[in-house]
């Protein structure tokens, strides 16, 4: 199972639920669904209040129980380490795959933390991060921001990923903007 890691803003916008949580307990495999269930302790929720309704406490995260079908494997054994988890809601349950954005909170740049906390949501409605994977690539729309990190650095941990968000400049136009300048 292979997938191109998304820009964190894309991960935020395309997810139903974005939370900060610790992985606790041993994973369990469900004998009916063949999903593996990780027990988590949620510490913060950044997106999904409306989707969840009253069930605002997520205690488990679900993933296919085999690697070849994009199951997520949690490698850290540190139960006090916090992770940013961006996933999909299916029947009220949080699902993630290898392709989901799951990262140690401490590994995120200050700008990314700010993005998840308050800024990425501003760009969700109107703006699109458009991956540029090979030259030439051009903007399909004024609301697109060309994401060239992978092209230039061969890594998703490039400058645009760590420091920029694609945000509305004016109606019908989105541009890369520094998350540093978004400090309230």
């Amino acid at each position: 199972c292979t997938c191109v890691p998304p820009h964190p803003q894309t991960a935020f916008c395309n997810s139903d639920l974005v939370i900060r949580a610790k992985f606790v307990g041993t994973p369990e495999v469900n004998q009916t669904t063949l999903y593996q269930r990780y027990e988590i302790k949620m510490t913060k929720m950044y997106k999904g209040f409306q989707a969840l309704g009253d069930a605002a406490d997520i205690r488990f995260v679900y993933t296919p129980a085999m690697e070849s079908v994009c199951g997520y494997f949690h490698r850290s054994h540190n139960r006090s380490e916090e992770f940013l988890i961006a996933g999909k809601l299916q029947d009220g349950l949080l699902h993630i795959t290898t392709c989901s954005f799951v990262a140690p909170w401490n590994s995120l740049s200050l700008a990314q933390r700010r993005g998840f906390t308050k800024t990425y949501t501003v760009g969700c409605e109107e703006c699109t991060v458009f991956p540029c994977l090979s030259i030439p690539c051009k903007l399909q729309s004024g609301t697109h921001c060309l994401w060239t990190d992978q092209l230039l650095q061969g890594s998703e941990k490039g400058f645009q990923s760590r420091h920029l968000a694609c945000l509305p400049r004016e109606p019908g136009l989105c541009t890369w903007q520094s998350l540093r300048s978004q400090i309230a």
Partner: antibody, heavy 113, light 111 residues
Amino acid sequence: QVQLVESGGGLVQPGGSLRLSCAASGFTFSSYAMSWVRQAPGKGLEWVSGISGNGVLIFYADSVKGRFTISRDNSKNTLYLQMNSLRAEDTAVYYCARWFDHWGQGTLVTVSS
Amino acid sequence: DIALTQPASVSGSPGQSITISCTGTSSDVGGYNYVSWYQQHPGKAPKLMIYDVSNRPSGVSNRFSGSKSGNTASLTISGLQAEDEADYYCQSYDFVRFMVFGGGTKLTVLG
């Protein structure tokens, strides 16, 4: 009581196809993931494929990926294994298992020219 | 390509206790509490004797017990009886290969 009865085994030439069936009774079929496990003559057990209760998640062992297809019909309480491009090394007794707690008696598949 | 390592054979006299080991890695036996043990008599289907490391299905004698330490699981049969003579297989969940088996251990109950 739980009962699993396999059928469809037999002699087939290399490159040929065969479809195994497993009729289940004595439990709520759709509530359990099912698996196929095989055992070559005089050898140990090898997991082949698995399918979730609703048929959404499907897993294969690398040795059969791209050649075998697992499926289920919950309305008929039946599990299937479609085997294509069969090889001599696929010769084995094929067992159908409810998760891994109850097993059928197996059906012999022989791949030989 | 056997994933879990078991001794090829083990023997004991009636009334004795024997232990069969099953060694894996932190990715299978050591990483999850999903170890099962099966008994297989010649020409018969495998029968589940132990699941989730140490649990016995109903109908299985309490002479059979399972345990795990690190990457090694063990099946202990106490008060050995003639009908215990069979092949025994361990099995573990593995995230990459889903389900893996040991190579099997032939248990002989000495006359």
